[in-house]
Structures are given as structure tokens and as C-alpha cells.
């Protein structure tokens, strides 16, 4: 029984489930938005290519004091293989181009829905 105990413990979350949960969280943010999200903070725009999740996290992690996106930041960190800290600047950021957090989240949601439909889960 001790040996079999391992089978009952939860394994890693399948990529499809993780992506679906991230999409659901972004839907919650966009639907429950009353005041300007994160007080209208601006973040770096990103290229939606390989490494997109890390780039998205690197952009959003620079928004401080915004509880609405804290869960999204945590979820994105699960898609990013390396540790991300504030101030990092990826080559996937579009230099000198910032957009509002609300637009960033909305557009990221649009893109992730397309990836999910196409079966691109990570």
C-alpha cells in the first residue's frame, strides 16, 4: 500500500488543462473589469512567437500593486521554464512599444483561444 500511495498523489497538470485554466482566468479578468485594469498601467508589447509565455510574464511582472493580475502572473510562470524577475527585458518584447494592461490581457486571451483551438498547448 505504501508503494501504491504514489498513484493517488496528483501528477503534473496536463498542458491542455493549464492553458484552459489560464484562458478562464483571463476571461474572468476581462469580464469583471470595472475600473481601468491596474489603473491603466502600460506594459511592453510582445511578439507572439516561441517564448511568448515568458515574454508575457516579463511584461506583466513589472506591474506592481495590481491584485487583479497576480493569479495570471503565477499561472504564466508555470509556462515559463526560467525564473522571471521584474526589470528583465526579453528579445521578444517590442522595444519602445507599450500598450495598456487591459488591452494586453484582452489580446493575449484572443491569441491563447486560437492556440487552444489549434491544439498548441505549450
Amino acid at each position: 500500500l505504501t508503494c501504491l500511495g504514489g498513484f493517488a498523489s496528483p501528477g503534473p497538470v496536463p498542458p491542455s488543462t493549464a492553458l484552459r485554466e489560464l484562458i478562464e482566468e483571463l476571461v474572468n479578468i476581462t469580464q469583471n473589469q470595472k475600473a481601468p485594469l491596474c489603473n491603466g498601467s502600460m506594459v511592453w508589447s510582445i511578439n507572439l512567437t516561441a517564448g511568448m509565455y515568458c515574454a508575457a510574464l516579463e511584461s506583466l511582472i513589472n506591474v506592481s500593486g495590481c491584485s487583479a493580475i497576480e493569479k495570471t502572473q503565477r499561472m504564466l510562470s508555470g509556462f515559463c521554464p526560467h525564473k522571471v524577475s521584474a526589470g528583465q527585458f526579453s528579445s521578444l518584447h517590442v522595444r519602445d512599444t507599450k500598450i495598456e494592461v487591459a488591452q494586453f490581457v484582452k489580446d493575449l486571451l484572443l491569441h491563447l483561444k486560437k492556440l487552444f483551438r489549434e491544439g498548441q498547448f505549450n
Epitope: 508589447s45 500598450i99 495598456e100 488591452q103 484582452k106 489580446d107 493575449l108 484572443l110 486560437k114
Partner: nanobody, 118 residues
Framework: GVQLLESGGGLVQPGGSLRLSCAAS????????MGWVRQAPGKGLEWVSS????????YYADSVKGRFTISRDNSKNTLYLQMNSLRAEDTAVYYC???????????WGQGTLVTVSS
């Protein structure tokens, strides 16, 4: 906010060519399917062409098929429309727009005028 800025319109003779550009800002351009719509003088809006977010799938109205080519450069946040063998009936204001079914993702440019005349 979101801005779509068209350029490249002008006066051209029948049979000539023009290349329209649409520079996008304030949004994650590569997330969007995009398209071109035109409005001839005194007429309604007419869909011209659209392209998926990756640039791999393109669609054209029968009236421009074989003459117009839509493309995009996601690294430059820019949409293009190459127009060849232009005809008088192509005279119109050409608008760049997002081409998404979902509500809330509808953005349009201000348009650029194309006049085909000798």
C-alpha cells in the same frame, strides 16, 4: 489606445499598381486576423481581403482575386495590400480593420483614398 493607420493611397492610371500599408499600434497585432474593406463613392462597404494571424491563410473577394495580394509582417505590426492591374471600379477609400468574430475586438483605421483614373 488602439490605432490603425493606413497609407499608400493616391492617384494611379488604369493598369497601374499601388501598395497600401496599415501600421498598427496599441494592440498585440499578431493575435489578430486582419483585413481590408473598401467603400466606393456613393456605395456601401465592400470586403476586399483578409488574412489569418499567422499569415498562412488568405481570402479574397472575387472582384480582386488574382490582382490583389494581402500580406502582413508581425514583427513590424504592419498589414499590406498589393494592388495590381487596377481598374476604375477599384476607386474607393480603403480601410484596414481587424477581422475577428468575437465582440470587443473590432478596430478600424481612418482609411486611405485610392483613385484609378486616366
Amino acid at each position: 489606445g488602439v490605432q490603425l493607420l493606413e497609407s499608400g493611397g493616391g492617384l494611379v492610371q488604369p493598369g497601374g499598381s499601388l501598395r497600401l500599408s496599415c501600421a498598427a499600434s496599441g494592440l498585440l497585432f499578431a493575435a489578430y486576423d486582419m483585413g481590408w474593406v473598401r467603400q466606393a463613392p456613393g456605395k456601401g462597404l465592400e470586403w476586399v481581403s483578409s488574412i489569418d494571424w499567422k499569415g498562412g491563410k488568405t481570402y479574397y473577394a472575387d472582384s480582386v482575386k488574382g490582382r490583389f495580394t494581402i500580406s502582413r509582417d508581425n514583427s513590424k505590426n504592419t498589414l499590406y495590400l498589393q494592388m495590381n492591374s487596377l481598374r476604375a471600379e477599384d476607386t474607393a477609400v480603403y480601410y484596414c480593420a481587424t477581422a475577428e468574430d468575437e465582440p470587443g475586438y473590432d478596430y478600424w483605421g481612418q482609411g486611405t483614398l485610392v483613385t484609378v483614373s486616366s
